[in-house]
Interface confidence: low
């Protein structure tokens, strides 16, 4: 048999297996070694009893999408039935006191194959043996503790394979510059340790995708904006938009990006080379927000001009050149660069928004029979923009991180926005008052940390014959500046 | 194998809360890259997504439905679970628990369960 | 939200014939040069089985006859030689974005 009779139906065109070499892969065209590395089809039934207690499931990662010329790393996981985890040595032990179907187990190992490999073997001092090598015959890479990797892992994609020993979570990272645009293939077969020979107990497969487009992701935040799973902000509040770019591995890391904004509200074109701008609408509507990102990344060298033909007599200097067929951005420059492009859209909705709270007086509310632990206690509260529809107070430790009461409750403010809230405070202290104002849209948030006195009769008859006191007979009032994100995450893959 | 198997009372009267749970086996719902979802399908009509629980416990609802709407977790007992309250009739529906890798597509379902909506 | 819309409602094939069934998104679902589009079979009383993911890709055990095509916001599911077996509701279903939506299914039936 061939890898590809084994690995899978994908068969590329030769043009994809000619222009898609993968550097230090092999071509699927070579020869399988059935008898070490045994092939079973889909249903067979041996695949049931290829691993003791159960199935192994390999989940199969990737990084994609990866801008061409990236690398893109794949992860192979494989996760064992329950109660059964890989130990220091790379044996396949019980997780101590775990209880599966079969009950708790005598036997510590599900596979020790430390033991098998002490016990076999007839090798010749070098650690060599015809069974230690991949399905195509190549020995087994000696790395320090090789012994304790005891699966062998084989990717295959583009028609060509790449085989990898390992322990239960492998990583292998391919470079794109050779490989066709859109979307591929990736298939892994795993194979297990047994005796002289292999079991494959998993396959896997998935999708992974290259692009000439850099993947470009947006999130986008602002104060007081209450849901962040909607495109909708509030106005003559900035918005901060913070681009992403999905290069996990670094390939634009010494490339120059230039960010080109357009707002969708007649504010023209802002260019930028920083990822964080802030934006704020001054009316409200549905607008189109546009993204170019443009960076200069590596790219294939041009090859160099064929040396020119011997003329009879001295040539002209040549006029312009003619219509390139490559796109702009597929020229490289003599610096072998390559100009990429990624883009971004997104329609926001702009309403009116409540967007500034202020307790602007704090007061002791006198009671005629006071409580032996109770103060009632009075905010008078401000807001800007819209009028709010709720008010939610949440009274906790002076860190503001232990909450001890909160409470909301729907209000009716007039044009003024002008409100009072009154909220019972059990025993002396000091206490973090947050006191949230919302509406549909938004969510305006303001803090104060208050001390709350002892109770004494003597204390409350005096406020009582000073007409009720201000903020500075009982209280000390300090304003925390406090403002809560809620960020807003475009959907991305 | 993995299997997800939907639990719940078949009968829910109007106005009450409909809940039901799926239980996981052949992998813990706590393995990179999988979400949970739940997606119901009314007798003789087409799927509705309702929401997910990623494994790392994030949670995402579809937003027709996001008002009533609570999937939770328990990881020690590998279930996941739907609360959807203020039930109408409009609400009877094959309840499907159902596995996501990633973004791609759903690929093992449970069996669903009926959930019908009378007084 | 994006909205799917399959045609035709009910088809009915020859044993043997191909039957082919369209899926229209009311937006783009390619993603970086991929369709997020997926094909599930549904029978009665079972859930839906995936046929195809990533437009063209075909699931774990699906026979060869199945296979799809497409891209932006037409795509196709194509059964090459109608077997008996493959009598069900075909649906289509996005899952580029939140929420993952479905198509309103094809019902195919032997002539």
């Known amino acids: 048999k061939r890898f590809h009779d084994v690995l899978g139906n994908e068969r590329p065109s030769a043009y994809m297996r000619e222009h898609n070499q993968l550097n230090g892969w092999s071509s699927d065209e070579n020869d399988w070694n059935e008898k070490l590395y045994p092939v079973w089809k889909r249903g067979d039934m041996r695949w049931k009893n290829s691993w003791k207690g159960g199935r192994v499931q390999a989940v199969l990662t990737s990084d994609s999408p990866a801008l061409v010329g990236s690398n893109i790393t794949f992860v192979v996981n494989l996760v064992f039935p329950r109660c059964q985890k890989e130990d220091a040595n790379g044996n396949i032990v019980y997780e101590k006191n775990c209880r599966n179907e079969a009950g708790l187990s005598a036997d510590p190992y599900v596979y020790n194959w430390t033991a098998w490999s002490e016990d076999s073997d007839g090798e010749n001092g070098t650690g060599q043996s015809h069974h230690n090598v991949f399905p195509d015959g190549k020995p087994f890479p000696h790395h320090p503790g090789w012994r304790r990797w005891n699966f062998v892992y084989v990717f295959h994609t583009l028609g060509q394979y790449f085989q990898k020993l390992g322990r239960c979570s492998v990583r292998v990272s391919v470079n794109t510059a050779n490989v066709t645009l859109g979307p591929q293939l990736m298939e892994v077969t795993v194979y297990r340790r047994h005796g002289r020979a292999y079991v494959p107990i998993a396959q896997v497969k998935d999708v992974y995708v290259v692009t000439d487009q850099i993947p470009v992701f947006v999130t986008m935040s602002q104060k007081n904006d209450r849901n962040s799973s909607d495109e909708t902000f509030l106005k003559d509040l900035p918005i901060t938009f913070d681009v992403l770019i999905h290069d996990p591995s670094h390939f634009l890391n010494y490339s120059t990006i230039n960010y080109k904004w357009s707002f969708g509200d007649n504010t023209g074109l802002f260019v930028s080379i920083n990822h964080t701008v802030n934006h704020t609408y001054v009316l409200n509507g549905t607008f189109s927000l546009n993204l170019t990102v443009k960076a200069a990344a590596p790219g294939p060298c041009p090859p160099p001009p064929p040396p020119p033909p011997r003329p009879p007599k001295p040539t002209p200097s040549l006029g312009p050149a003619g219509d390139n067929p490559l796109g702009l951005s597929e020229i490289p420059d003599e610096n072998c660069q390559i100009n990429r492009y990624g883009h971004f859209q997104a329609t926001i909705t702009i309403v009116e928004g409540i967007l500034e709270v202020n307790i602007i007086q704090t007061t002791d509310v006198l009671m005629l029979v006071p409580g032996p632990d109770s103060s009632l206690i009075d905010f008078v509260v401000t807001c800007q923009g819209s009028i709010p529809t709720e008010v939610c107070t949440i009274i906790s430790d002076p860190t503001c991180e232990i909450t001890q009461n909160a409470v909301c409750s729907p209000v009716d403010v007039d044009e003024m926005c002008l409100l009072t809230v009154r909220r019972a405070f059990n025993g002396s202290g000091t206490y973090c008052v947050n006191l949230t104002l919302g509406d549909d849209t938004s969510l305006a948030l303001t803090s104060t940390l208050i001390s709350v006195p002892d109770r004494d009769p003597a204390s409350s008859l005096r406020m009582a014959n000073s007409g009720g006191g201000g903020l500075n007979d009982i209280f000390e009032a300090q304003k925390i500046e406090w403002h809560e994100h809620h960020h807003h995450h475009h959907h991305h893959h | 194998q993995v299997q997800l198997q939907e639990s719940g009372p078949g009968l829910v009267k109007p106005s009450e809360t409909l809940s039901l749970t799926c239980t996981v086996s052949g992998i813990s719902i706590t393995t990179g890259n999988y979400r949970w979802s739940w997606i119901r399908q009314p007798p003789g009509k087409g799927l509705e997504w309702i929401g997910y629980i990623y494994y790392s416990g994030t949670i995402t609802y579809n937003p027709s439905l996001k008002s009533r709407v609570t999937i939770t977790r328990d990881t020690s007992k590998n279930q996941f679970s739907l609360e959807l309250s203020s039930v109408t009739a409009a609400d009877t529906a094959v309840y499907y628990c159902?596995?996501?890798?990633?973004?791609?597509?759903?690929?093992?379902w449970g069996q669903g369960t009926l959930v019908t909506v009378s007084s | 939200d994006i909205v799917m819309t399959q045609s035709p409602d009910s088809l009915a094939v020859s044993l043997g014939e191909r039957a082919t069934i369209n899926c229209k998104s009311s937006?783009?679902?390619?993603?970086?040069?991929?369709?997020?589009l997926n094909w599930y079979q549904q029978k009665p009383g079972q859930p839906p089985k995936l046929l195809i993911y990533a437009a063209s890709t075909q699931g774990s055990g699906v026979p060869d006859r199945f296979s799809g095509s497409g891209s932006g916001t037409d795509f196709t599911l194509t059964i090459s030689s109608l077997q008996a077996e493959d009598v069900a509701v075909y649906y289509c279903?996005?899952?580029?974005?939140?929420?993952?939506?479905f198509g309103g299914g094809t019902k195919v039936e032997i002539k």
């Open positions: 159902a596995r996501d890798l990633t973004h791609w597509y759903f690929d093992v």
């Open positions: 279903q996005q899952s580029k974005e939140v929420p993952p939506t």
């Open positions: 937006e783009s679902v390619d993603y970086y040069g991929i369709g997020f």
